[in-house]
């Protein structure tokens, strides 16, 4: 099946993704839509009043006017001047200025523990499951199944560190080889990267603030997945990482240390504790083959616990299995030795929700799942209200250019590798690389940060979550402290080598360039975004997991015809871009194709037949919501609301002429002001801090 | 309190085989290990081999292996041991017992025996 | 098989005396050693097992010591209820073994 073109021009025509760009309503103002009746919120205002200098006509002659979509947002200010403010509007600046920043950390700080009951509900829902993965004998000969079993099972828990520490308790158990682990590991880089993507989904109702934060979130599945397509291939031919850690773990005498720190985990915890606390021992039980605790609940009950050391008669196959004669002993048919028994005694419950409810895990992790992902949406949305709204005029140009600016020249090439430094730095603080770029994703999406500068930030961020497993490695008992040092290595080695395949040559970027692609569709399509999402970290998976238990013969006889028409079709997109010519005419293009085999638009079609049913009454509510939250956050009477349903009552893709819309913008204030209609704000609401 | 009644006493032609019941009562039957023990004229206590009747699994002296075997008819609270192939020197007191000192082969309760005499 | 020799296999005492009863195993058996008190025409019957503890209702005057091969069967004061054969037992492994008795009598 052939690609679908909205990829392959993703950079050369953006204006063709730009449905702004190509559809817009009749620049007569339209009486039904000059005012929103059902908003009594709302001043009364004409949505687009569009002046001589913006004229169709001039549009269409200058072509240079429909803006690069991956160009940042000019977000000017729209506030009174400091200067020009009295005492009492200084105050009021400054507290409202306060205010927000409180504001801004009460919802990051939900954020990232929505992002923890996240995961918690992952496990609950499908940890058995994944524990269960890891239990598939395949794994030790068959790397490919190893890949995919990393990736499920952390897509399933949520969570690297999860499957990470089960790889290296089952690796420190002889039950998995450290060959036989790299795989997996690889598998759990790829599938941490899904959280982001999900985050990014939350921003869907701006297209071009969707455009940008799927792309900057999606820049890191595909530096995780092209990483892998050339570095697994690279490990099962040479065996360099575990070759090169092995060295490492036997140049030194560790002496395992203290316990890695908990940064954000500190101020978190006692909040996440309080909803569920989870027991994590039985999913790497259950990946060790311990029948027991397949019966075991993942809600932990009892967090206060006596453990008493105990001598007991317990009886043994034979006299070979006692540790000296006198320490046995019959009772005429039965051996018995005295063994050292542990029991432990619950003495204080949990103090979390679900104690007391005794509620299957499934059904625990469901609520956890809807409740988690609206307090992340919820959370998500107000981040970006806040961060619209502080991020204006000189404190939106100082932060933009800090962020955004290189180094003068001659040293302009190591911004990229400080902000690297940067993303492992920030990784490091917040222990986790999912709550890292799952916050750098909105900040991509309302445009404060370019998508070449996240992707260095969140290569930075893959290094971090591995130099805080190599702590926690240094940290863990005897036993497993060598097999959790190499994996750590391992997981480290293999970001490094990714690092110098995809980013320092900038021809060698391309996670950039396919993240732009797929953003460019996912705006057009939004449906692709959840699409995408469930073939590369479900579909694909499954499959090759599916296969891989098949056997070798089948794996190979269905991925290579796979392969192959995958590298047939790549070839033949690069010769119809590069030097058409040499082709024949039929193969100039993807015409000679079935419509619905190299374009999404008939797809489109069937999808929104589906869902249109849905669309209404979602928007009714979407408003509410939005028109509450606007209500209680204080936000100018000109906020935009429920973009999605604007999107919606314009038409999905209405015929008109290429002129500027304000979906290129980031709100309808700035939109205002590019049309030339600036209002003067009201100084309770709008307030600029310098 | 604890009971073990055996069979009254048998006279029995070598070659021949006897078998041995143990009426058991005042306790649960199937909680404790039956033990079989001989004596024979003034000799001293031969251990022949035990039973547990809740699983029904046995344990024979590799001296009797093949010669002996033990069952326990739950129903009826009852232990039974054939010994076959019958030789003179079989002749001896066969005492039931159970130990009640749960994990130990210290037998505390016995049987009255039942002399078995094996004689041409 | 593990053999229990007992020593002496028989013996003499006054009331009052002291008597000891000595039992050696061929191997390492622990401290899975029983000692049993068979009078005359009787059913044999518990004194000690884990060769110290005594079974319920057994006088103060027996007791019994001992770890690995070597046991020993003491009666503090010989009582003339005592005259008995005394047989020590391991249960250390199957088969479980007896010694060959001692006979005690009262001078």
């Known amino acids: 099946m052939a690609p679908w073109p909205e990829l392959g021009d993703a950079q050369p025509n953006p204006s063709k993704y730009l449905e702004g760009a190509t559809s817009q309503q009749p620049i007569t103002p339209d009486k039904s839509k000059e005012t929103n009746k059902t908003d009594n919120t709302e001043v009364p205002v004409t949505k687009f009043e569009l002046l001589p200098t913006y004229s169709t006509a001039t549009l269409i002659e200058e072509p240079t006017e429909v803006d690069d979509p991956w160009n940042l947002p000019t977000l000017q200010d729209s506030g009174i001047k400091w200067s020009e403010r009295d005492a009492k509007g200084k105050i009021l600046c400054v507290f409202q200025g306060i205010g927000r920043l409180i504001l801004l950390l009460g919802f990051l700080y939900f954020f990232v523990c929505s992002l923890d009951v996240l995961s918690s509900a992952f496990q609950l829902v499908g940890g058995k499951m994944a524990g269960q993965f890891f239990s598939n004998s395949s794994i030790m000969s068959n790397p490919l199944l190893g890949l995919v079993i990393g990736v499920l099972v952390t897509v399933f828990v949520q969570s690297s560190s999860t499957s990470t520490s089960i790889v290296v308790s089952m690796v420190a158990s002889s039950l998995l080889t450290v060959r036989a682990a790299i795989p997996i590991i690889m598998g759990a880089n790829i599938g941490t990267s899904i959280t982001n993507t999900i985050v990014a989904l939350m921003q869907v109702g701006d297209r071009s603030e969707f455009r940008r934060a799927f792309a900057g979130a999606t820049v890191h599945d595909f530096f995780n997945w092209l990483s892998v397509l050339v570095l697994l291939p690279v490990e099962v031919a040479t065996h360099y990482l575990e070759v090169v850690t092995q060295l490492i773990v036997e140049s030194f005498h560790f002496k395992n240390g203290e316990d890695a720190p908990d940064l954000l985990k500190v101020i978190t915890k006692p909040f996440t504790k309080l909803i569920v606390q989870l027991d994590k021992k039985v999913i790497s039980q259950i990946a060790m083959n311990d029948e027991t605790a397949k019966n075991k609940s993942l809600v932990k009950i009892w967090c206060k616990t006596f453990t008493n050391m105990t001598q007991m008669n317990v009886t043994v196959p034979s006299m070979a299995n006692c540790t000296s004669p006198s320490l046995c002993w019959t009772d005429g048919i039965q051996i018995w030795t005295m063994k050292n028994v542990t029991y432990k005694e619950n003495i204080a419950k949990c103090q979390h929700i679900f104690v007391n409810f005794h509620l299957p895990d499934l059904a625990v992790g469901i609520i956890l799942l809807i409740i988690s992902l609206l307090v992340l949406c919820g959370c998500l949305i107000m981040i970006v209200k806040i961060l619209g709204s502080v991020l204006k005029g000189q404190v939106a140009t100082v932060i933009k250019k800090t962020i955004n600016t290189d180094f003068p020249f001659p040293f302009a090439w190591l911004t990229g590798y400080l902000a690297i430094l940067v993303g492992a730095g920030m990784t490091f603080i917040v222990q986790s690389s999912s709550v890292f770029t799952s916050a750098l994703t909105p900040l991509i999406g309302i445009g404060v940060i370019t998508i070449e500068r996240a992707y260095p930030l969140t290569l930075g961020s893959n290094i971090g979550t591995t130099t805080t497993a190599i702590l926690a490695a240094l940290a863990s008992p005897g036993n497993t402290l060598r097999s959790s040092l190499q994996i750590a290595l391992c997981h480290f080695f293999f970001n490094i080598s990714g690092i110098l395949l995809w980013y320092p040559i900038p021809f060698t970027r391309l996670p950039i360039r396919m993240a732009k692609g797929l953003g460019n569709i996912s705006a057009k399509y939004r449906w692709f975004a959840i699409f995408y999402l469930i073939i590369f970290f479900f579909l694909i998976p499954l499959t090759v997991f599916g296969l891989s238990l098949a056997g070798w013969p089948v794996l190979v006889g269905v991925g290579v015809p796979v392969v192959f028409i995958i590298i047939l079709v790549l070839c033949l997109r690069l010769l119809q871009s590069r030097c058409p010519r040499v082709l024949p005419k039929k193969l100039q293009n993807w015409n000679f194709l079935p419509l619905c085999m190299h374009s999404l638009k008939p797809w489109d079609a069937v999808i929104s037949k589906f869902t249109g049913p849905f669309q209404m009454p979602c928007c009714c509510c979407c408003r509410v919501c939005c028109r509450v939250c606007c209500l209680l956050c204080g936000c100018p009477k000109c906020c935009r609301c429920s973009k999605c349903c604007q999107d919606l009552e314009e038409g999905q893709e209405a015929q008109g002429v290429p002129v500027k819309a304000p979906e290129t913008f980031d709100n309808i204030t700035i939109s205002r002001e590019a049309q030339g209609e600036v209002r003067a704000p009201d100084s309770k609401t709008e307030c600029t801090a310098l | 309190q604890v009971q073990l009644v055996q069979s009254g006493a048998e006279v029995k032609k070598p070659g021949a085989s006897v078998k041995v019941s143990c009426k058991t009562s005042g306790y649960t039957f199937i909680t404790y290990n039956m033990h079989w023990v001989r004596q024979a004229p003034g000799q001293g206590l031969e251990w022949i081999g035990a039973?547990?009747?809740?699983?029904?699994?046995?344990s024979y002296n590799q001296k009797f292996k093949g010669r002996v075997t033990m069952t326990a008819d739950t129903s009826t609270s009852t232990v039974y041991m054939e010994l076959s192939s019958l030789r003179s020197e079989d002749t001896a007191v066969y005492y039931c017992s159970i130990s009640t000192i749960i994990t130990t082969g210290a037998v505390d309760y016995w049987g009255q025996g039942t002399l078995v005499t094996v004689s041409s | 098989d593990i053999q229990m020799t007992q020593s002496p296999s028989s013996l003499s005492a006054s009331v009052g005396d002291r008597v000891t009863i000595t039992c050696k195993a061929s191997?390492?058996?622990?401290?899975?050693v029983a000692w049993y008190q068979q009078k005359p025409g009787k059913v044999p019957k518990l004194l000690i097992y884990w060769t110290s503890t005594r079974h319920t209702g057994v006088p103060s005057r027996f007791s019994g010591s001992g770890s690995g091969t070597d046991f020993t069967l003491t009666i503090s004061s010989l009582q003339p209820e005592d005259v008995a054969t005394y047989y020590c037992?391991?249960?250390?492994?199957?088969?479980?073994?007896f010694g060959g008795g001692t006979k005690v009598e009262i001078k």
């Open positions: 037992q391991q249960y250390s492994r199957i088969p479980l073994t």
């Open positions: 191997q390492d058996v622990g401290t899975a």
């Open positions: 039973i547990y009747p809740g699983s029904g699994d046995t």
